[in-house]
């Protein structure tokens, strides 16, 4: 299915930063592995791969085509 890369943004909804208070987010975090269709506005976000939306974080991530890496699958994997 290619390489999965996570967008660095977490929108703060699940306390993506260690310095943030995550006390009120434990129930949502159980859904961290769930994905939905990417919003239409991210149609061109993933350059060499397909976009999926991390439900718990409300942020796009890319599943890269074979041979590509990077948050947006924008780089050729030299080790591929």
């Amino acid at each position: 299915d290619g390489n999965s890369t996570r967008s660095p943004e977490t929108n703060g909804l699940l306390c993506g930063d260690p310095e943030e208070n995550c006390a009120a987010t434990t129930t949502q975090s159980k859904r961290k592995g769930h994905f939905s269709r990417c919003p239409k506005q991210y149609k061109h976000y993933c350059i060499k791969g397909r976009c999926r939306f991390v439900v718990a974080e409300q942020t796009p991530s890319c599943v890269c085509d074979e041979g590509y890496i990077g948050a947006r699958c924008e780089r050729v994997d030299l080790f591929y």
């Epitope: 967008s7 943004e9 929108n11 703060g12 930063d17 943030e20 269709r37 506005q41 947006r72």
Partner: antibody, heavy 116, light 106 residues
Framework: QVQLLESGGGLVQPGGSLRLSCAAS????????ISWVRQAPGKGLEWVSY????????NYADSVKGRFTISRDNSKNTLYLQMNSLRAEDTAVYYC?????????WGQGTLVTVSS | DIQMTQSPSSLSASVGDRVTITCRAS??????LGWYQQKPGKAPKLLIY???SLQSGVPSRFSGSGSGTDFTLTISSLQPEDFATYYC????????FGQGTKVEIK
């Protein structure tokens, strides 16, 4: 705690330019998408633009496309909005907000007035 | 562009009342909808995301529901600090906000 502090607003004539800045602190700026959202006096909210964490994926509202440019400097934890060819209808409080789809932290806003 | 239409544009209510605000999208947006609260002279505050998920730190009297084109924000028992303007926002296509609903004291 998360803080976003906008600056650079002021009075400008129609056709003029202005550059807004947003200084971020309290979180790892380089990991987050950031947006500009504006609010004309007594009116509702209007999303203006966003930029992804790496500064490579950008979108604009149709109303500002071709006139405004969003950018960021992750080494300075700062977001920018270069506004050119300003019009009276661009008069608003401009907020920077954390996020691209949803906005969980907002600055206090900076007022831009376009008037002759 | 997706248009977001809120109703009512304003309402009067008393402390303890149950308040419902609706938001309709001009086309289906699945559950890509957020709700914000804004008080005069202040920045907006995120209340609800993904149509029904409560943002961290927001009181449980706020709830959201709906999918597709029709969405609802409910305040189960209005508190004095809840008098404000509420906005919905879709984030399927490029982000757009509703025109706002002002909740005033009766």
């Amino acid at each position: 705690q998360v803080q976003l502090l906008e600056s650079g607003g002021g009075l400008v004539q129609p056709g003029g330019s202005l550059r807004l800045s947003c200084a971020a602190s309290g979180f790892t700026f380089s990991r987050y998408w950031i947006s500009w959202v504006r609010q004309a006096p007594g009116k509702g909210l209007e999303w203006v633009s966003y930029i992804d964490s790496g500064g490579t994926f950008i979108n604009y509202a149709d109303s500002v496309k071709g006139r405004f440019t969003i950018s960021r400097d992750n080494s300075k934890n700062t977001l920018y909005l270069q506004m050119n060819s300003l019009r009276a209808e661009d008069t608003a409080v401009y907020y920077c907000a954390r996020g691209g789809s949803l906005f969980d932290y907002w600055g206090q806003g900076t007022l831009v007035t376009v008037s002759s | 562009d997706i248009q977001m239409t809120q109703s009512p544009s304003s309402l009067s209510a008393s402390v303890g009342d149950r308040v419902t605000i609706t938001c309709r999208a001009s086309q289906g947006i699945i559950s890509y909808l957020g709700w914000y609260q804004q008080k005069p002279g202040k920045a907006p505050k995120l209340l609800i995301y993904a149509a029904s998920s409560l943002q961290s730190g927001v009181p449980s009297r706020f709830s959201g529901s709906g999918s597709g084109t029709d969405f609802t924000l409910t305040i189960s028992s209005l508190q004095p600090e809840d008098f404000a303007t509420y906005y919905c926002q879709q984030y399927d296509a490029l982000n757009t906000f509703g025109q706002g609903t002002k909740v005033e004291i009766k």
